[in-house]
Interface confidence: medium
């Protein structure tokens, strides 16, 4: 799930030493641990749009932020796959790509992200309603899928209204080296705290009490990422009418690279993959979820009619593992 | 037909290194992650090793890493585990297992295993 | 790690009965999969991502659960199934197994 966390707001420091300098070396480290914490877990983002040009058209696009290999994505609608969801494609970044009506076009987009775009006539063509789901199998992550719908009241071409305020992306953020950025900012972050042991802990107050406070925004990973690591997923249903959000009982794991000194997504991938890439509309995307997503011996051929066969555009499974590697 | 076949399991002292090896023929080897499973005396599955397709990445349990190593050749479509300063405690029988990405990672097929035995 | 327990360590059922075993994470985990282990053989893919069956088995298998706690079903017990039944998660370093069910026939 992607929420939106707000770093808590600190009570502004008394007049004294610390002054104007002291009160930004304590927030710093509120920003940093965020930063810190957000890029060490694995998720999805999904994105749906209505086509301009075509307003039954769809495109749908989804994201895996973390730093395993990605080696199968499959893109449902109706829901989860086995959970009344049906296979719309299937792509392996070696064994191709495979998709199935009302599928037009299916592909890669990044090392780490997809595309697919649905015809838009017929009684199979989606509704403004309609879920769709990507669920990515990476190693050693695991399984993590995100369903995502069209946002109410879209105007065509548009997949959600922008964010409104200033985002700190966990995916942007590793494109451009966080990993680097990370482990400095980690280190000054113990830094800081060793240096502020022995002065009285700040008062930590919810930042709506203070409008006037300073306060940082960072798309906050679903799981691992608040103190507890467990957090409620939260599925955005937006069913042609404004979006409500259903809490449900807290799933889904940390990842195997959680516990790693740094966090950070290593992607090498350079400026012009990513710059491609939308920022995920905030109500575009729902949590990692975790329930029937394929039906029963359903596993889709390894070749045969209607395999696209394709060359890796990553690479031999370019995307570095985090742990134990040799 | 998909097959697994391990090789290389022998009684040796501890301290002593052995090379395990895994042939792979029914399928395109170099498409998968493999990995190394050993059942203990006690009948508990304990994951040792992971490998890569293309081989470029290798991931360990902690208290194997230094010790274990994994390794495969893509063109005799071989697994091997190289395995150094062997305690008692890496007694085991030794299974080579096909990550099926299409069944997400699970380990869809197993080979029959070797036995490695480490006493004095 | 994630410790995976499952129970009843050893369980028996008749030919037709139902059959539920249970496996339990220290901490919440993603998907489960489930392996079979007959004697003298090695273990073969029952259930991947929770409850989805491995091609070839029989559909009288099914397997539900979330976050900490997951289940194996038998829908009706047969001779064949008399086995010891494995457990295993990979959301969390390192890939872990439960110690087993031992499943008897009765």
């Known amino acids: 799930m992607r929420t939106e966390a707000q770093v808590p707001a600190l009570q502004p420091p008394e007049p004294g030493l610390e002054g104007a300098m002291g009160h930004r070396t304590l927030v710093l480290p509120w920003v940093l641990l965020t930063l810190c914490v957000t890029a060490g877990t694995p998720e999805v983002w999904v994105q749906v749009r209505m086509e301009a040009t075509e307003l039954s058209s769809f495109t749908i696009r989804c994201g895996f932020l973390g730093s395993g290999s990605i080696s199968l994505v499959t893109v449902s609608w109706g829901g989860p796959n086995g959970a009344g969801g049906t296979t719309l494609a299937v792509l392996h970044p070696e064994r191709g790509i495979r998709q199935w009506a009302p599928a037009r076009q299916a592909r890669w987009e990044t090392q780490s992200s997809i595309s697919l775009i649905l015809e838009g006539s017929g009684a199979s063509s989606p509704c403004a309603n309609t879920t769709f789901c990507c669920k990515f199998a990476s190693f050693p992550e695991g399984s993590w899928e995100a369903c995502g719908s069209l946002p109410p009241s879209s105007d065509p071409g548009l997949s959600a209204p922008p964010t409104p305020a200033p985002i700190l992306r966990a995916d942007l953020a590793g494109i451009l080296g966080v990993s680097g950025v990370l482990l400095f900012g980690c280190v000054y972050l113990l830094h800081l705290l060793r240096r502020h042991k022995h002065r009285p802990a700040p008062r930590l107050q919810p930042s709506r009490t203070s409008p006037q406070a300073p306060r940082a925004r960072a798309w906050a990973p679903s799981q691992a990422s608040q103190a507890a690591l467990h957090v409620p997923y939260a599925t955005i249903n937006t069913s042609c009418r404004p979006a409500t959000l259903d809490t449900a009982h807290p799933h889904g794991g940390p990842s195997w690279w959680a516990s790693l000194p740094t966090h950070a997504a290593h992607r090498p991938q350079g400026p012009a993959a990513w710059a491609s890439t939308p920022i995920p509309a905030r109500g575009s995307f729902v949590s990692v979820e975790n329930g029937l997503y394929a039906q029963a011996g359903e596993r889709p051929p390894h070749t045969g009619p209607g395999l696209t066969l394709f060359p890796d555009p990553r690479g031999p499974r370019a995307m570095e593992g985090p742990l134990g590697v040799r | 037909e998909v097959m697994l076949v391990e090789s290389g399991g022998d009684l040796v002292k501890p301290g002593g290194s052995l090379k395990l090896s895994c042939a792979a023929s029914?399928?395109?080897?170099?498409?998968?992650?493999m990995s190394w499973v050993r059942q203990t005396p006690e009948k508990r599955l304990e994951w040792v090793a992971t490998?890569?397709?293309?081989?470029?990445?290798?991931y360990y349990l902690d208290i194997l890493k230094g010790r274990f190593t994994i390794s495969r050749d893509n063109a005799k479509n071989t697994l091997y585990l190289q395995m150094s300063s062997l305690r008692s405690e890496d007694t085991a029988l030794y299974y080579c297992?096909?990550?099926?990405?299409?069944?997400?990672?699970?380990?869809?097929?197993w080979g029959q295993g070797t036995s490695v035995t480490v006493s004095s | 790690q994630i410790v995976l327990t499952q129970s009843p360590a050893i369980m028996s059922a008749s030919p037709g009965e139902k059959v539920t075993m249970t496996c339990s994470a220290s901490?919440?985990?993603?998907?489960i999969y489930w392996y079979q282990q007959k004697p003298g053989s090695s273990p073969r893919l029952l259930i991947y991502?929770?409850?989805n069956l491995a091609s070839g088995v029989p559909v009288r298998f099914s397997g539900s659960g979330s976050g900490t706690s997951y289940s194996l079903t038998i829908s009706r017990m047969e001779a064949e199934d008399a086995a010891t039944y494995y457990c295993q998660q990979w959301s969390s370093y390192p890939l872990t197994f439960g110690a087993g069910t031992k499943l008897e026939l009765k």
């Open positions: 297992a096909r990550h099926e990405d299409y069944a997400w990672y699970a380990m869809d097929y």
């Open positions: 991502d929770t409850s």
């Open positions: 029914g399928f395109t080897f170099s498409s998968y992650f």
């Open positions: 490998i890569s397709g293309g081989g470029d990445k290798t």
């Open positions: 901490s919440s985990v993603n998907y």
